[in-house]
């Protein structure tokens, strides 16, 4: 089978500062030199793009300057970090990997990582 398998954790809990990190790993059927990684959010069967980056194997992953995502790559593994998350952003985050070059093109879609975000409690006023 020449399909591409993508693995990602089932559940991740965001930090109190609204930061969530997870690893997206893909089993490449070929030797890709150019890879595109996209994070999608699925809610009520609607899918929206959170962020995307294309990188050359061996080089760093570069998201757009205004992106809420950052990441690093190592071989067939991508370490993704999503920042600025709030409780309303809780949901399923899908890792999509595309082997862009050389031919043939391959698509790989993970099962998704459920990210739970809990807004921090506001600090009580101190009486000092």
């Amino acid at each position: 089978c020449k399909a591409m398998h993508v693995a990602q954790p089932a559940v991740v809990l965001a930090s109190s500062r609204g930061i969530a990190s997870f690893v997206c790993e893909y089993a490449s059927p070929g030797k890709a030199t150019e890879v595109r990684v996209t994070v999608l959010r699925q809610a009520d069967s609607q899918v929206t793009e959170v962020c995307a980056a294309t990188y050359m194997m061996g080089n760093e992953l570069t998201f757009l300057d205004d992106s809420i995502c950052t990441g690093t790559s190592s071989g067939n593994q991508v370490n993704l970090t999503i920042q600025g998350l709030r409780a309303m952003d809780t949901g399923l985050y899908i890792c999509k990997v595309e082997l862009m070059y050389p031919p043939p093109y391959y698509l790989g879609i993970g099962n998704g990582t459920q990210i739970y975000v809990i807004d921090p409690e506001p600090c009580p006023d101190s009486d000092f």
């Epitope: 089978c1 020449k2 399909a3 591409m4 398998h5 059927p29 150019e34 595109r36 996209t38 999608l40 899918v47 929206t48 793009e49 995307a52 294309t54 899908i94 999509k96 595309e98 862009m100 070059y101 031919p103 043939p104 093109y105 391959y106 698509l107 879609i109």
Partner: antibody, heavy 118, light 108 residues
Framework: QVQLVESGGGVVQPGRSLRLSCAAS????????MHWVRQAPGTGLEWVAV????????YYADPVKGRFTISRDNSKNTLYLQMNSLRDDDTAVYYC???????????WGQGTMVTVSS | EIVLTQSPGTLSLSPGERATLSCRAS???????LAWYQQKPGQAPRLLIY???SRATGIPDRFSGSGSGTDFTLTISRLEPEDFAVYYC?????????FGPGTKVDIK
């Protein structure tokens, strides 16, 4: 709303050229791969070509390789198919289609007819 | 290249009946990358099912998809008059992207 509208079809002689256009609206064009799919009269669907995102990566079906060129202008939200050295068996309705977030072709244009005949 | 074969070529049924359409791949296809489309005469194809079993937006629940590996099925539980059309399966996991030859569902 999300829409694709093809244009540029017509009747052309074998060996000649034609350029098809596909105008996109209602979505962030540069965030999606775009395909051309054709359908000869009375037959099934045949994938023709795809162009990804910024337009750097393109792939073609064997029957059109070396004759057809897919391109896109993200500033104009438009997809193109330049068809050279046209043959009788290129006669078909040509559809543009969007590769959705999860890969399937989720939005299709209405199609434009190309007839290659002497 | 992954070759897709569909059967039967034509399915003659009456409204209200159940339709079962088959799609077979020449090599294993991940279920994540198998789609079904509906096409009516003079119209563009319409995405029905993606990922082998997920219904596209706005598709009625009488349409369902199943299968894995090399064998996939589209089921229409109770045919409505508007369901008589041609149905195509497609793999989109790798290039070249390929379609099956189609199954025509017509009125008996």
């Amino acid at each position: 709303q999300v829409q694709l509208v093809e244009s540029g079809g017509g009747v052309v002689q074998p060996g000649r050229s034609l350029r098809l256009s596909c105008a996109a609206s209602g979505f962030t064009f540069s965030s999606y791969g775009m395909h051309w799919v054709r359908q000869a009269p009375g037959t099934g669907l045949e994938w023709v070509a795809v162009i990804w995102y910024e337009g750097r990566n393109k792939y073609y079906a064997d029957p059109v390789k070396g004759r057809f060129t897919i391109s896109r202008d993200n500033s104009k939200n438009t997809l193109y198919l330049q068809m050279n050295s046209l043959r009788d068996d290129d006669t078909a309705v040509y559809y543009c289609a969007r590769a959705g977030d999860l890969g399937a072709f989720d939005i299709w244009g209405q199609g434009t007819m190309v007839t290659v005949s002497s | 290249e992954i070759v897709l074969t569909q059967s039967p070529g034509t399915l003659s049924l009456s409204p209200g009946e159940r339709a079962t359409l088959s799609c077979r791949a020449s090599q294993s296809v991940s279920s994540s990358y198998l789609a079904w489309y509906q096409q009516k005469p003079g119209q563009a194809p319409r995405l029905l099912i993606y990922g082998a079993s997920s219904r596209a937006t706005g598709i009625p629940d009488r349409f369902s998809g199943s299968g894995s590996g090399t064998d996939f099925t589209l089921t229409i539980s109770r045919l409505e008059p508007e369901d008589f059309a041609v149905y195509y399966c497609q793999q989109y996991g790798s290039s070249p992207f390929t379609f099956g030859p189609g199954t025509k569902v017509d009125i008996k």
